[in-house]
């Protein structure tokens, strides 16, 4: 079990380093200072990392690897890793401009035990913690991940960087510094401190290696006060207690001369009350402070290390696994631990909620809810079951007017209306030819029960969609075989859409022939011959007239002339509305005068009665 103290600690402070170090002093510390995180410049930048309703806060994870190999953050962070504290809670203000987001306090510090490699790769992740009323506690999600490769000498100044991840921008600084007694650009040389700190004047560091003095002179930052400043790294200026400023020339306070401790102020002549180095206990996490001649030293409790015991060397005893994860290993400080995460969570500390809804387990448009311990599907109306897989009878009690049929599906009843009707319940009259449904030059005929398409030769289908020979002759030949220019062209209706008119002797079939000749006084007719129950696709001798542009035989689209649109050139022709057992073979004497003159794609109204049983619309 995790003690209340420790569990509170884990939720507020640095939580883990993925490579766990023993409680020996590290050779040095990589420090990362996040300056800002927010929407980047340019369009499409996000307004806020929080959802509109829930407050959230940010935290950061840094992963360091030696060399110049950028790798996934999940692979070992061989130089170390650290997690920041949680930042202040942020709630999006509707309408407010997108701000730079409130950040966690303090540095991210990654101690390294061995030599600083000089070249390293970093990965910095920005995480969002949503603080709503989710079941199972807060939800974590990765907002941005930036990575880079850098050369960096230990002991150098802060390096500034700006990285962009998608629409987010992260500004930060970083440096590597050695922890005494290590010195040098790789923190590999060791010096033993003497009783007094170095003064910046002569520039020689008064510390010796374990055998002899460190050879290289140490030059502090130019202008560093020789009385109140000292340095441990080249170019540095660190102040004695009671002094501040970039060159250690500003006393911390001049309001009191009561304290006997501290250097004399040049301006007031009284002693500046320099607080003792252990005042306020700078050692975090229960560390005990002891003063040294130069500063202070923290003795850290088990599981923590660093100058101020601020870095957590987490083991299973510290309860590092979130969300009910099972911790394995890590019994001694030198060994890492592994979290075995429960369903719905992942990450080295089970801190990442798995988006199991991304697999779209809910069928039929159901809404997926990941509750952490389980998935739930909120089904649309008309569906039920754990995954909304059961289609309820949404047509029950629903009526579709005018011969429409109710179609189940989609959670709401839908009427498939009979031709000539539309609307939700098929109560609205519709002009079936208005949408120009007949393709490839087919003529649309509207009648009381819907429409029929009269296809141009060489086309089939209820809407003339299928060219019989798509690689055949190109559009609009001068005259099809067997016809002279100026002769009417013949169109054959799909047989199932034919119109048979019963008249005369019982069993005899009559065919309505619409002979249309615009601008001509003579009429053509039709002699009808019986045929097989369904027509061959080569029913007409002049079926080579495809009345279309070349469809193309390759891949992709090939545009065709829109023969459903009124054209300026209107070929004259005979429209044969046939029954399944009748073919038009040749033109002979007229039966009927023309009924209507129209253009391709326009509706032609049949202005005569006929029994509905004869019309079949597939």
């Amino acid at each position: 079990m995790v003690s209340p103290r420790m569990s509170g600690l884990l939720s507020q402070t640095v939580i883990l380093a993925l490579i766990f170090l023993p409680q020996t002093r590290p050779a040095g510390v990589f420090e990362l200072q996040i300056h800002s995180f927010g929407p980047g410049p340019g369009p499409g930048a996000p307004r806020s990392p929080c959802s509109a309703r829930l407050p959230c806060r940010l935290f950061f994870r840094v992963c360091l690897k030696p060399g110049l190999s950028e790798e996934a953050a999940e692979s070992p962070c061989a130089l170390g890793a650290a997690l920041s504290a949680r930042g202040p809670v942020y709630t999006e203000q509707p309408g407010a401009p997108a701000p730079d987001l409130p950040l966690p306090d303090g540095l991210l510090q990654v101690p390294f035990r061995d030599a600083w490699p000089g070249t390293f790769s970093f990965i910095i992740e920005t995480w969002r913690e949503e603080l709503g009323d989710q079941i199972g506690g807060p939800a974590w999600s990765l907002l941005a991940r930036v990575a880079g490769r850098r050369r960096l000498a230990a002991g150098g100044p802060w390096a500034r960087d700006i990285q962009r991840a998608g629409a987010w921008e992260l500004r930060f600084s970083y440096r590597a510094r050695c922890e005494p007694p290590a010195v040098g650009t790789a923190c590999t040389r060791l010096c033993r401190p003497r009783s007094a700190p170095s003064r910046c004047g002569p520039g020689l560091r008064p510390c010796a290696p374990l055998e002899d003095e460190c050879e290289a002179p140490l030059v502090c930052r130019a202008g560093c006060s020789p009385e109140h400043g000292f340095c441990e790294q080249p170019g540095e200026c660190r102040c004695l207690e009671g002094w501040t400023g970039p060159l250690c020339t500003v006393p911390v306070s001049t309001s009191s001369c009561l304290s006997p401790r501290g250097p004399s102020s040049a301006t007031t002549g009284c002693l500046v009350p320099g607080p003792g180095p252990c005042d306020g206990n700078p050692c975090a996490n229960g560390g005990s402070c002891s003063e040294t001649p130069r500063s202070f030293e923290c003795t850290c409790p088990r599981g923590f290390y660093g100058l101020r015991c601020e870095v957590s060397g987490v083991t299973c005893a510290d309860g590092p696994c979130f969300n009910g994860g099972l911790c394995v290993g890590g019994a001694d400080p030198d060994s890492a631990y592994i979290c075995h995460c429960p369903p719905g969570f992942q990450g080295s500390n089970c801190e990442k909620r798995v988006d199991r809804c991304s697999l779209q387990p809910c069928r039929n448009g159901g809404l997926c809810l990941d509750l952490g311990h389980a998935l739930r599907c909120r089904c649309r109306a008309g569906f039920a079951g754990p995954r909304c897989e059961h289609d309820l009878d949404d047509c029950a009690g629903r009526a579709c007017a005018n011969g429409g049929t109710c179609v189940e599906g989609g959670g709401a009843h839908r009427c498939s209306c009979a031709l000539g009707f539309g609307g939700r319940d098929c109560r609205e009259r519709a002009d079936p030819c208005a949408a120009r449904p007949c393709a490839h030059g087919g003529r649309c005929y509207a009648h009381f029960s819907g429409l029929v398409c009269a296809c141009a030769p060489g086309y089939m289908g209820a809407r003339c969609e299928f060219p019989v020979h798509p690689d055949g002759a190109s559009a609009l030949p001068a005259a099809p075989p067997g016809l002279r220019p100026g002769d009417p062209q013949r169109y054959l209706l799909p047989p199932a859409l034919g119109l048979l008119v019963a008249a005369g002797v019982a069993g005899a079939a009559l065919l309505l022939v619409h002979v249309r000749r615009r601008g001509h006084s003579q009429d053509a007719g039709s002699r009808l011959l019986a045929g097989t129950p369904e027509p061959s696709v080569h029913a007409l001798p002049d079926a080579l007239n495809n009345l279309r542009t070349q469809e193309g035989s390759g891949d992709g689209p090939s545009s065709s002339v829109d023969w459903n649109r009124p054209e300026d050139v209107d070929p004259q022709g005979i429209y044969v509305i046939s029954a399944p057992s009748i073919y038009a073979r040749e033109v002979a004497t007229p039966l009927f005068p023309p009924l209507h003159t129209g253009r391709a794609g326009q509706r032609q109204h049949l202005l005569f009665p006929y029994p509905s049983s004869i019309l079949s619309v597939k």
């Epitope: 809407r463 969609e465 299928f466 199932a496 469809e551 649109r565 597939k618």
Partner: nanobody, 119 residues
Amino acid sequence: EVQLVESGGGLVQPGGSLTLSCVASGSTSSRNAMGWYRRAPGKQRELVAGISSNGSKVYSDSVKGRFTISRDNAKNSVYLQMNSLRAEDTAVYYCYYFRTVSGSSMSYWGQGTLVTVSS
């Protein structure tokens, strides 16, 4: 742009069966027709079977009674069940997609899948 991907072709003995599948993706439309065409060696491409958006079907005389076309609108797919296959059915079979959007018509073809009927 509509992409068509056919599958199911292969080598089959006379009298055997195959099912071809075609999936349309991209800018598909509800007002469409889908079908199967074939091109035998040395011949031009010809319609085998087609099915309109309302389910109406057409077949060529040579396959009537042996082939069955069907479609799954939810999956934007069309299928051709081929039974009692003959040597003369050997051809490259192409999926066809015809759509009409706002009065503009467009035809699309797949790459083709080879069906070989041989003993």
